[in-house]
């Protein structure tokens, strides 16, 4: 059973998670991003589901493609490198995630604009935050 | 010092068309972004659009994407919007306000929303 | 999109007193660059909108120093030291870090 300080480590670990995402979505969804149009034609792939930690293998599938798409910023839009950022989000997700069950992911039929995917995974963390708290 | 005036308001019914301008003037237009934002009357602030320094970028809220066009004349320091199948509910003052300010770095620098026209009223009735 | 909400609506004060106006953003306004692009706009009646603070806590040119502005992430205020005649309007709170969103407007008036 979950003790309340594992309930508080997983807490704090997805209030970080939706900080990440939160400042990279702030980073490319605004007017003065040169590659914003050119960022949008790329698609991502959204979970069929996503209620529960485990679903966040979904997240993790598709950190590489996030990754190639930041590539495309401006350095000055990120204080830390894509390649720096990426990667902490990475060990945030497989620590909340587990490595103890194997999940596969189930996509939607209909693909995601960077923009899109990015609120659908703030909209998660958000959502598991509250049943936490 | 810096001046922005707005002009092309009126009265005109549902369906019509309107164009309106923004004169600027005591700064180097060319280089800035510039904003459209509107206030229906007694209601708040509501961003309609902007444009890029040299018009190559362009952004529209939702509640006028496809009937509004923003653009602009860097030759003759002006700002424009073509506003298209107007509705009641775009009845409202017309703001336009200054953006950042593209550097030959090429990236964005100052403050959004520093300066401020007058305003010009656009109201759409039968 | 980003959604302002400020509180209160409403404020009542009395000359020479302090006030305080809220503002609380759906998700955080730091920017990928690091900047927190918060800013507070005053609107006079019958006036078009001025802009007061900028980046949570830089005053424009020409503001006086009675408008101080603070916060991080998602919350933040404004306050007037000292609230004069002049400063009775309507005061929006706003966030640039993604497109532009506003507050619905905080009236401030002298009772």
């Known amino acids: 059973a979950p003790t309340s300080s594992s309930t508080k480590k997983t807490q704090l670990q997805l209030e970080h998670l939706l900080l990440d995402l939160q400042m990279i979505l702030n980073g490319i969804n605004n007017y003065k991003n040169p590659k914003l149009t050119r960022m949008l034609t790329f698609k991502f792939y959204m979970p069929k589901k996503a209620t529960e930690l485990k679903h966040l293998q979904c997240l993790e599938e598709e950190l590489k493609p996030l990754e190639e798409v930041l590539n495309l910023a401006q350095s000055k839009n990120f204080h830390l490198r894509p390649r720096d950022l990426i990667s902490n989000i990475n060990v945030i997700v497989l620590e909340l995630k587990g490595s103890e069950t194997t999940f596969m992911c189930e996509y939607a039929d209909e693909t995601a604009t960077i923009v899109e995917f990015l609120n659908r995974w703030i909209t998660f963390c958000q959502s598991i935050i509250s049943t936490l708290t | 010092q810096v001046q922005l005036v707005e002009s092309g308001g009126g009265v005109v019914q549902p369906g019509r068309s309107l164009r309106l301008s923004c004169a600027a003037s005591?700064?180097?237009?060319?280089?800035?972004?510039m904003h459209w934002v509107r206030q229906a009357p007694g209601k708040g602030l509501e961003w309609v659009t902007v444009?890029?320094?040299?018009?190559?970028?362009?952004y529209y809220a939702d509640s006028v994407k496809g009937r509004f066009t923003i653009s602009r004349d860097n030759s003759k320091n002006t700002l424009y919007l073509q506003m298209n199948s107007l509705r009641a509910e775009d009845t409202a003052v017309y703001y336009c306000?200054?953006?950042?300010?593209?550097?030959?770095?090429?990236?964005?620098?100052?403050?959004?929303?520093?300066?401020w026209g007058q305003g010009t009223t656009v109201t759409v009735s039968s | 999109d980003i959604v302002m909400t400020q509180t209160p609506l409403s404020s009542p004060v009395t000359l020479g007193q302090p006030a305080s106006i809220s503002c609380r953003s759906s998700?955080?306004?730091?920017?990928?660059?690091?900047?927190?692009?918060l800013s507070w706009l005053q609107q006079r009646p019958g006036q078009p909108p001025r802009l007061l603070i900028y980046?949570?806590?830089n005053r424009f040119s020409g503001v006086p120093d009675r408008f101080s502005g603070s916060g991080a992430g998602t919350d933040f205020t404004l306050k007037i030291s000292r609230v004069e005649a002049e400063d009775v309007g309507v005061y929006y709170c706003?966030?640039?870090?993604?497109?532009?969103?506003f507050g619905q407007g905080t009236k401030v008036e002298i009772k």
């Open positions: 306000a200054r953006g950042s300010y593209y550097d030959s770095s090429g990236y964005y620098f100052g403050e959004d929303f520093d300066y």
């Open positions: 005591g700064f180097t237009f060319s280089i800035y972004g």
């Open positions: 444009i890029w320094y040299d018009g190559s970028n362009e």
């Open positions: 998700q955080s306004l730091v920017h990928s660059d690091g900047n927190t692009y």
């Open positions: 980046k949570i806590s």
């Open positions: 706003m966030q640039v870090t993604q497109f532009p969103t």
